[in-house]
């Protein structure tokens, strides 16, 4: 049978020929009568056999990491007969390991993020080195990790490569650390090979700093003319934290001011002081408010860092603005009777300079030839007024500071012209009427009405009468209807066109004013031949034709 021991060849042997071992048949008596042959991948190129002795040699440098075993076949032949002495057999050559590979960190680059102020023992990251040597061959691939850089803040577990925190770190002092880890094979014994890697450890922020005002006092100014909502200045607190942890909210301490407010600009983290209510220099020319600042997001476990909010004092000076005159009233309404003489008193307006210097005021009335105003604000008429022409005047009064004519205020002035009874009532239209020759007595021939241009406090009431002469003339009579109308009636039977073709009746109309005014109004009555119909329509037609110059039969 075949005789051999297990074959091992050390890797990386530099000799041209390295004896591995011997293959032999137990029938071989050493007289060189047998021939040994090597078959299979690597036979002749990597391994050779001494055909006479069966000694096997490696003739090439081997790399265990490339290939760690070779399966070859062996034959032994009797030279005399050419026959196989033993059946063909497989055998294995194993390549034994030497420590020729250093540990390598394959997952580089390493980067980790850990919250600042994390307690000792907090896991940061695990680094893993790989060694291509045989893990089953002694300690060639047994690794030990150590820290070359990173003390005293970090430590590494020697066998696992787990990096942990060994001392609390403050991001506000240093926000990142480079840690250098070494991996050594041979569990660190002499002759060990090593590899290193760098780990960038970044500290993430926690909210361990409250915002603090840089200034203990801010001085701001606001113009008294500033509208509400005006930004009058900014205040700024600083927070050593970053991102969300540095977001802050500004506010005014309770009961400090109803006049100002602070809003937070979350882009810039500034506090913007705004005017909440208009200020008046003459009323109050300075204010003092206390502002405070707090972080927007504070987890419960970090409240210990935020016990007392930072505060600052803000002094706000109100700037005086030369303000226009201020009228006592927003508008004025005066009354004056019509027909009062020129220079009559209408009313008094008053404006004052709200500023401290109290400039004298000059007044004027815009676009008016009817009224005057003097420097005391007294308004008088400059012309006689007629209510029946204009019952109301809508004017504008301007007050100007004497020392600064650019400071002007204007307000409306309404003057109502009051009525006096200065117009008598009149016919509401021109009346011309007709009576038939054959008209009977008591026949209504016209209804009349009157108008009065005066304004009546109560309702107008008119009184109708015939003049004294016409009362004595018994041809017509008048009846007052008591409703500001009257009717004219015939006071006889029959009229003669030839004898008296036209009557002119004088009618007196009186009003109920004090004193009462009366006017005389003429009513024209034509006599006409109405035929048997007795219709004044025919009469009207005839008159119309006559007036056009036609002759009727």
């Amino acid at each position: 049978g075949w005789v051999w021991n297990q074959f091992f060849v050390p890797e990386e042997m530099n000799t041209t020929s390295h004896h591995i071992g011997q293959l032999r048949s137990d029938l071989d008596n050493g007289n060189n009568s047998f021939q040994y042959k090597l078959l299979g991948a690597g036979a002749g190129s990597t391994f050779i056999i001494d055909e006479r002795t069966g000694d096997i040699y490696a003739i090439q440098k081997l790399d265990r990491e490339e290939r760690s075993l070779y399966i070859l076949r062996a034959q032994v032949i009797d030279i005399a007969t050419g026959r196989a002495v033993e059946p063909e057999s497989e055998f294995v050559i194993k390549v034994s390991d030497i420590n020729d590979n250093e540990p390598k960190f394959l997952d580089e680059p390493y980067e980790a993020i850990v919250p600042e102020m994390s307690p000792e023992g907090t896991l940061v990251i695990q680094v893993t080195a790989s060694d291509a040597d045989d893990p089953s061959s002694g300690n060639n691939a047994r690794l030990l990790y150590s820290l070359l850089q990173g003390q005293p803040y970090f430590s590494v577990e020697p066998t696992t490569g787990v990096i942990r925190i060994s001392s609390k770190m403050d991001r506000e002092l240093q926000d990142e650390y480079w840690v250098i880890i070494q991996a050594k094979d041979m569990i660190g014994q002499p002759g060990a090979l090593s590899g290193t890697t760098s780990v960038l450890i970044k500290l993430s922020d926690v909210n361990d700093n409250k915002p603090i005002f840089k200034e203990s006092l801010y001085r701001l100014t606001v113009s008294e003319s500033a509208p509400t909502g005006t930004s009058i200045g900014t205040i700024m607190a600083y927070d050593n934290d970053i991102g969300e942890n540095a977001e802050m909210d500004y506010s005014i301490e309770e009961d400090d001011s109803q006049t100002f407010d602070i809003i937070t600009n979350h882009e810039t983290q500034e506090g913007i002081v705004i005017l909440k209510k208009k200020v008046d220099f003459e009323h109050q020319n300075h204010y003092g408010i206390r502002a405070k600042v707090k972080n927007h997001h504070v987890p419960e476990q970090l409240m210990k860092y935020h016990t007392e909010a930072s505060t600052t004092f803000i002094k706000i000076q109100v700037e005086d603005v030369d303000e226009p005159p201020l009228f006592l009233l927003p508008y004025y309404v005066f009354e004056v009777f019509e027909e009062t003489p020129q220079g009559s008193f209408v009313g008094v307006v008053s404006a004052t300079d709200p500023d401290n210097r109290k400039s004298p005021i000059r007044y004027s009335i815009t676009r008016s030839k009817v009224f005057n105003i003097n420097d005391n604000g007294t308004i008088t008429t400059s012309n006689s007024l007629d209510r029946e022409i204009s019952a109301w005047y809508n004017l504008s009064i301007t007050a100007t500071e004497k020392y600064n004519i650019e400071q002007i205020s204007s307000i409306p002035l309404y003057v109502q012209v009051l009525n006096i009874n200065d117009h008598a009532p009149e016919f509401s239209q021109y009346y011309e009427t007709y009576v038939c020759e054959n008209a009977g007595s008591g026949q209504v021939i016209q209804t009349i009405s009157a108008v009065d241009r005066d304004e009546s406090i109560e309702e107008h009431h008119f009184y109708f009468n015939l003049s004294v002469e016409d009362t004595n003339n018994s041809s017509f009579t008048i009846i007052d209807n008591q409703d500001n109308t009257a009717v004219i009636l015939t006071n006889r039977t029959g009229f003669n066109l030839q004898e008296e073709p036209v009557f002119y009746i004088s009618i007196l109309i009186a009003d109920n004013g004090i004193p009462s005014l009366t006017s005389t109004n003429t009513l024209t009555i034509h006599v006409c031949d109405c035929g048997d119909s007795g219709s004044t329509q025919t009469c009207q037609y005839q008159e119309l034709v006559l007036s056009m110059g036609f002759k009727t039969e």
Epitope: L39, R67, S68, I71
Partner: antibody
Framework: QVQLQESGPGLVKPSQTLSLTCTVS??????????WSWIRQHPGKGLEWIGY???????YYNPSLKSRVTISVDTSKNQFSLKLSSVTAADTAVYYC????????????WGQGTLVTVSS | EIVLTQSPGTLSLSPGERATLSCRAS???????LAWYQQKPGQAPRLLIY???NRATGIPDRFSGSGSGTDFTLTISRLEPEDFAVYYC?????????FGGGTKLEIK
């Protein structure tokens, strides 16, 4: 798991050099115990081993192609490449890259293959 | 070089039947160094069996391999429709590494 992907021109002129690259993903080309191999298959025919390389640079070629073949490796890119010079129409084939277990010699996994046509 | 001869060149069977594919080596090959592959049209070969009889990851147990020396066999105990493909054997026992010419397994 490890995946392989061939890339390169699909058409090469006769007498020129065919160049292909195999990109390894899901694992390191620098792992011990593996060869990185090229195999080809002529249209409608069987498989022919071209050669392989160990990541440290040692190469093994099929004697029938040895004079024209160069296989190289770029560990920084996790790639290995094939160059076949002086090509003729007989080199028209689907070219595969594959990982070989160095101790026992089986191919697993394979790339999906790329057809290279040699034509003027 | 070791020449691997596969037979038959084409095998026509129906689903459910047993398939036996042969691979003969021109020289003795270590059983550790023989593998089988399956290739479907338009796809790369896929490892089925390594070391003569070991199934690769994810390969159903209907596939089995056997043999030694110069004669090796791939057996598919009960054919499924997806098993119809070309099968190649491959050796690593001697340089150059070689493949058989393939057996085409087709549906009858």
């Amino acid at each position: 798991q490890v995946q392989l992907q061939e890339s390169g021109p699909g058409l090469v002129k006769p007498s020129q050099t065919l160049s292909l690259t195999c990109t390894v993903s899901g694992g390191s080309i620098s792992s011990g115990g593996y060869y990185w191999s090229w195999i080809r298959q002529h249209p409608g025919k069987g498989l022919e081993w071209i050669g392989y390389i160990f990541y440290r640079g040692r190469t093994y070629y099929n004697p029938s192609l040895k004079s024209r073949v160069t296989i190289s490796v770029d560990t920084s890119k996790n790639q290995f490449s094939l160059k076949l010079s002086s090509v003729t129409a007989a080199d028209t084939a689907v070219y595969y890259c594959a990982r070989v277990y160095s101790n026992y010699g089986w191919f697993d996994p394979w790339g999906q293959g790329t057809l290279v046509t040699v034509s003027s | 070089e070791i020449v691997l001869t596969q037979s038959p060149g084409t095998l026509s069977l129906s689903p459910g039947e047993r398939a036996t594919l042969s691979c003969r080596a021109s020289q003795s090959v270590s059983s550790s160094y023989l593998a089988w592959y399956q290739q479907k049209p338009g796809q790369a070969p896929r490892l089925l069996i390594y070391g003569t009889s070991n199934r690769a990851t994810g390969i159903p147990d209907r596939f089995s391999g056997s043999g030694s020396g110069t004669d090796f066999t791939l057996t598919i105990s009960r054919l499924e429709p997806e098993d119809f493909a070309v099968y190649y054997c491959q050796q690593y026992g001697s340089s150059p590494l070689t493949f058989g010419g393939g057996t085409k397994l087709e549906i009858k």
